[in-house]
């Protein structure tokens, strides 16, 4: 009953993180224009991967798509295939989960076939939610990166007046759900290889089998042996389930969202 | 086609305040924001502020920010400017615009502040 | 807050004759997010409210002839009007359409010479 909870859950969670995923990659407020020094701006600019916007007085927003491939800078080529990648692996995770579900039963789908494909979706799910966290925090750190360089160059005009102020941007709203999708998504992937666990068949006792040897009418009755992986061959022997599955996954570490002014 | 239409003239005596209205059709009422503009007699234009009808949002133009009150009524489609403690200089033609570039404007509402 | 300065305050040019009327902000309207400058021009005539004939400095509202065209970038903007008709005679004002409060040229008044 726990681990069709805990897989469940993991894959709830995981398509919510995955769904987080693909909505942040398709907003557009990936960044947004700082209004520290210019709170009054009647025209706000915002930028996401695909293309830029420009919310003007009336209310009007246009956005320009960006039509380009090789004129935009690698780093943010690096976000949009990270952010697929992550969309790509978290779908296909989620595809092979719902298979891999307890609840559903396809077939005559044994219990060792269903773990397989448990781990299997919840690494996938790992990985998804890591390159989703990986592609935001790049972003973000070209932000910060370009924001201070903006601030340092920020005024420039004629004879100390100032004629243009050089628009900063600053973190959008979609960096923030694309943290926390990549981490529903990176949890759920946990929760999927815990699950997982608890699916496998860890032990397995060989019923007593006799051999006669020549001459003797003796009964060898051997030990039961221990099965060496949890995905045992043997499937017409007789599968013991460990019900307390045990977490010994190494403790996920988050990144650490810094604060800047 | 886009149309604003607004209230009918209003004569104020100080310190009375007046609400004109303005009434879009032919457009999204929540798509765009609804500005308003002071012209008094002869002289230029003057920017009061705007209402957002979508989130109900304001933008003041700090001269009328204490005075000035907007508010829209998205059912009816209509967009108010409420001026209250009206003086003598407050005697002008109210417009309201909207559209990109404030491309439409109302017909304007002459407002006289008078003892 | 932004001031415009419209040059001249009256202007009496011939028909069929050119007509430049100019604007000056005192901080840029120039948009970096999308390379745009920020700035409207309008036309009054007496009774009426006013008409949108160009915004973002150089782009004529639909329904605007084509005599009229708008140009500048930065701080310094022009209107102008390559073939004047009897109908042009009105009042002419810029707007900053960048920051707000929003603000208005005093106006350029335009007459028949």
């Known amino acids: 009953m726990a681990v069709t909870a805990c897989q469940g859950l993991g894959f709830v969670v995981s398509l919510i993180g995955i769904a987080g995923i693909i909505a942040a990659t398709c907003m557009d407020q990936w960044s947004t224009q700082d209004l520290y020094n210019n709170p009054v701006t009647a025209v706000f600019n915002y930028q996401g991967l695909w293309r830029s916007c420009v919310r003007e007085s009336s209310g009007f927003t246009e956005c320009r798509g960006y039509f380009t491939l090789l004129g935009l800078p690698a780093m943010l080529q690096a976000v949009r295939a990270l952010m697929i990648v992550g969309i790509v692996l978290g779908a296909i995770g989620l595809l092979v989960s719902i298979f891999a579900l307890k609840c559903i039963r396809i077939g005559s789908m044994e219990d060792s076939a269903k773990a397989n494909m448990t781990l299997t979706s919840g690494i996938m799910f790992i990985v998804s939610g890591l390159c989703a966290i990986a592609g935001v925090s790049v972003f973000a750190n070209m932000l910060v990166t370009n924001f201070w360089m903006s601030t340092a160059n920020m005024y420039t005009g004629m004879g100390g007046m100032v004629q243009t102020v050089q628009t900063r941007y600053t973190f959008g709203a979609a960096l923030f759900v694309g943290w926390v999708a990549g981490g529903l998504t990176l949890i759920g992937g946990v929760m999927m290889c815990i699950a997982c666990r608890g699916l496998a068949p860890e032990e397995t006792n060989y019923k007593a089998v006799s051999y006669h040897a020549s001459g003797h009418s003796v009964a060898y009755k051997p030990g039961g042996f221990k099965a060496s992986t949890g995905f045992g061959s043997n499937t017409k022997n007789k599968k013991i389930y460990d019900g307390g599955a045990r977490t010994e996954d190494e403790v996920q570490s988050y990144p650490s969202k810094h604060d800047y002014v | 086609q886009v149309q604003l239409v607004q209230s009918g003239a209003e004569v104020k005596k100080p310190g009375a305040s007046v609400k004109v209205s303005c009434k879009a059709s032919?457009?999204?009422?929540?798509?765009?924001?609804i500005h308003w503009v002071k012209q008094a007699p002869g002289q230029g234009l003057e920017w009061i502020g705007y209402i957002s009808p979508g989130n109900g949002g304001s933008n003041y133009n700090l001269k009328f920010k204490d005075r000035a009150t907007m508010t829209r009524d998205t059912s009816i489609s209509t967009a108010y400017m409420e001026l209250s403690r009206l003086r003598s200089d407050d005697t002008a033609v109210y417009f309201c615009?909207?559209?990109?570039?404030?491309?439409?404007w109302g017909q304007g509402t002459l407002v006289t502040v008078s003892s | 807050d932004i001031v415009m300065t419209q040059s001249p305050d009256s202007l009496a040019v011939s028909l069929g004759e050119r007509a430049t009327i100019n604007c000056k902000s005192s901080q840029s309207l120039f948009n970096s997010g999308n390379q745009k400058n920020y700035l409207i021009w309008y036309q009054q005539k007496p009774g009426q409210p006013p008409k949108l004939l160009i915004y973002r400095a150089s782009t004529r509202d639909s329904g605007v002839p084509d005599r009229f065209s708008g140009s500048g970038s930065g701080t310094d903007f022009t209107l102008t009007i390559s073939s004047l008709q009897a109908e042009d005679v009105a009042v002419y004002y810029c707007q900053n359409d960048y920051s707000y409060p929003l603000t208005f040229g005093g106006g350029t008044k335009l007459e028949i010479k």
């Open positions: 032919g457009f999204t009422f929540t798509s765009y924001n």
């Open positions: 615009a909207t559209g990109r570039g404030f491309a439409y």
